[in-house]
């Protein structure tokens, strides 16, 4: 009984078509397949960035894989041939693996690369990144940004630089079109005169850098003789209220602070009949429902209440 | 040609501060950034930390924050690096030394040795 | 911070013995790896940078090669004013970090 063996794929490689991680994996079916033209061969494949603790695994009947890496770091991958039981009678088969590597040629020392980078979607609608110059460089430096999404043909250059003494140290983008919930790839590098600059790369998702703007339209009602209800409205802007949490902050005749955190945009106070003044300030985030991560807008304007008897008086801003 | 002169021999206190010097001629200053490297006897090299002699920019190594303040006079092409609140452990040969635009190290000081007794 | 594991830590070889010294670093660098020699009581002279790249007027006998986060030093045929301890450093990021040194003695 001869043992069954499978070759590995051929020429796998990682191809990079330019935009800024995003990468391909691709390879071709291995030799000597003749024997098993009735059998649909797999191929597992496993792929990281090296330094990484864990290879991510896919199985395929596919000749090519796509995805996203941090190409600050290398790349490897290894692919081998399965040849299911149904083909071997008996156990599944494996081949051996291939191997393959990529990387970036890096130039440039680390002092030269950006510092501090900073990225903030404002309101879901406003895209605007920001960074230092490296601790190294010169003011014959320049630094380039460029992005690539999923709908994109290719990377795009920022055209809109915030600029300082000359440098360009942030970008404010166009519209990003159907640019949520997807891997959002950004490249800075740079040129000077006397020395080359080392680039950055960075990837994340918009929906989760979003800071929206704050609450407006503060109102305060009073419910009963011990309960005041406030109010507020939802930030002006795309985000859909289903988005929100908010957070409270609540000053009682100068002393008693109480911060709350709602998904609504109401919140009951209870309250004595002493009570001379009421403040309160509203802060919104996207909560988790609509993102994994985000940022707390500024805090809305004051609203106050103070003399007269809330019962008579409905305050708004 | 390039030097990187350094100041001389210290024996300082326990508690004491003392400030180095290292002294630039055969470039422009403005142009490198300046590091600092830490050797105790016998022991390997330790990064402090860098300075731009341009704009005053420096980055340090987290073990030296609080310890060492690095400081340049452009008029004079000196970089400084000031060591506080000393310690036997301290006790060290310290070298300035400048990159060239693609890889550390181009040029060493000759090191200064800093012996911390009382 | 990226630690620099460097061996040997010391080593006895004979004059026109080929010597190597590794460093293995705890992440990826990149190829952003210096090899210098110092002699006792003298500052660290810079032999190797990018891995494999000879500083101008070192010897032809010093090369450097590897890459992601194994490297390594030869000294294809030791001569004499070779003693000394080297040290490999990585400069990917900051803080810079050293090997703990390889002294070489004569044998």
């Known amino acids: 009984d001869t043992e069954i063996k499978v070759n590995p794929p051929q020429d796998f490689e990682i191809v990079d078509p330019g935009y800024l991680g995003y990468l391909y994996l691709q390879w071709q079916p291995p030799l000597s397949l003749d024997h098993f033209k009735e059998c649909t061969v797999e191929y597992e494949l496993k792929y990281r960035n090296i330094g990484s603790e864990t290879w991510k695994t896919i199985i395929t009947k596919n000749l090519h894989y796509k995805d996203g890496f941090d190409l600050n770091k290398g790349i490897e991958a290894k692919i081998h041939t399965l040849l299911p039981w149904q083909c071997t009678n008996g156990s599944e088969v494996q081949s051996s693996w291939a191997e393959t590597t990529y990387w970036i040629s890096p130039q440039g020392i680390p002092e030269t690369k950006v510092q501090d980078m900073d990225c903030v979607y404002y309101n879901w609608q406003y895209l605007l990144c920001s960074w230092k110059p490296g601790i190294g460089v010169l003011l014959d430096t320049n630094y380039n940004l460029f992005y690539w999404y999923e709908g994109l043909d290719h990377a795009l250059q920022c055209v809109d630089y915030i600029k300082a003494d000359g440098q360009n140290i942030g970008c404010r983008f166009p519209y990003l079109e159907a640019s949520d919930y997807k891997d959002f790839y950004i490249c800075v590098n740079g040129s000077s005169e006397n020395k080359p600059i080392r680039s950055s790369y960075f990837t994340f998702q918009l929906q989760n850098i979003v800071k929206p703007l704050p609450p407006v339209y503060l109102t305060f009602t009073r419910e009963s003789s011990c309960e005041i209800k406030l109010k507020w409205s939802i930030p002006l802007g795309p985000i859909p209220a289903r988005c929100f949490d908010y957070e409270i902050e609540i000053r009682e005749d100068d002393t008693t602070l109480v911060t709350a955190t709602v998904e609504n945009e109401t919140y009951t106070l209870k309250t004595t009949n002493e009570t001379r003044q009421l403040c309160f300030v509203v802060r919104s985030k996207v909560n988790i429902y609509c993102s994994d991560d985000g940022i707390w807008s500024e805090w809305s304007d004051k609203q106050c209440w103070e003399g007269e008897d809330l019962s008579k008086k409905t305050l708004l801003r | 040609e390039v030097q990187l002169q350094q100041s001389g021999p210290e024996l300082v206190k326990p508690g004491a501060s003392v400030k180095i010097s290292c002294k630039t001629s055969?470039?422009?200053?403005?142009?490198?950034?300046m590091h600092w490297v830490k050797q105790s006897h016998g022991k390997s090299l330790e990064w402090i930390g860098i300075i731009n002699p341009n704009n005053g920019g420096t980055n340090y190594n987290q073990k030296f924050k609080g310890k060492a303040t690095l400081t340049v006079d452009k008029s004079s092409s000196t970089a400084y690096m000031e060591l506080r609140s000393l310690t036997s452990e301290d006790s060290a040969v310290y070298y300035c030394?400048?990159?060239?635009?693609?890889?550390?190290?181009?040029?060493w000081g000759q090191g200064t040795t800093l012996t911390v007794s009382s | 911070d990226i630690k620099m594991t460097q061996s040997p830590s010391s080593m006895y070889a004979s004059l026109g013995e080929r010597v190597t010294i590794t460093c293995k670093a705890s992440?990826?660098?990149?190829?952003?790896l210096s090899w210098f020699q110092q002699k006792p009581g003298k500052s660290p002279k810079t032999l190797i940078y990018r891995a494999n790249r000879l500083v101008d007027g070192v010897p032809s006998r010093f090369s450097g090669s590897g890459s992601g986060q194994d490297y390594s030093l030869t000294i294809s045929s030791l001569e004499y004013e070779d003693m000394g301890i080297y040290y490999c450093l990585q400069y990917d990021e900051f803080p810079l970090t050293f090997g703990a040194g390889t002294k070489l003695e004569l044998k």
């Open positions: 055969g470039y422009t200053f403005t142009e490198y950034t």
């Open positions: 992440q990826d660098i990149k190829s952003y």
């Open positions: 030394a400048r990159p060239s635009a693609t890889h550390y190290f181009d040029y």
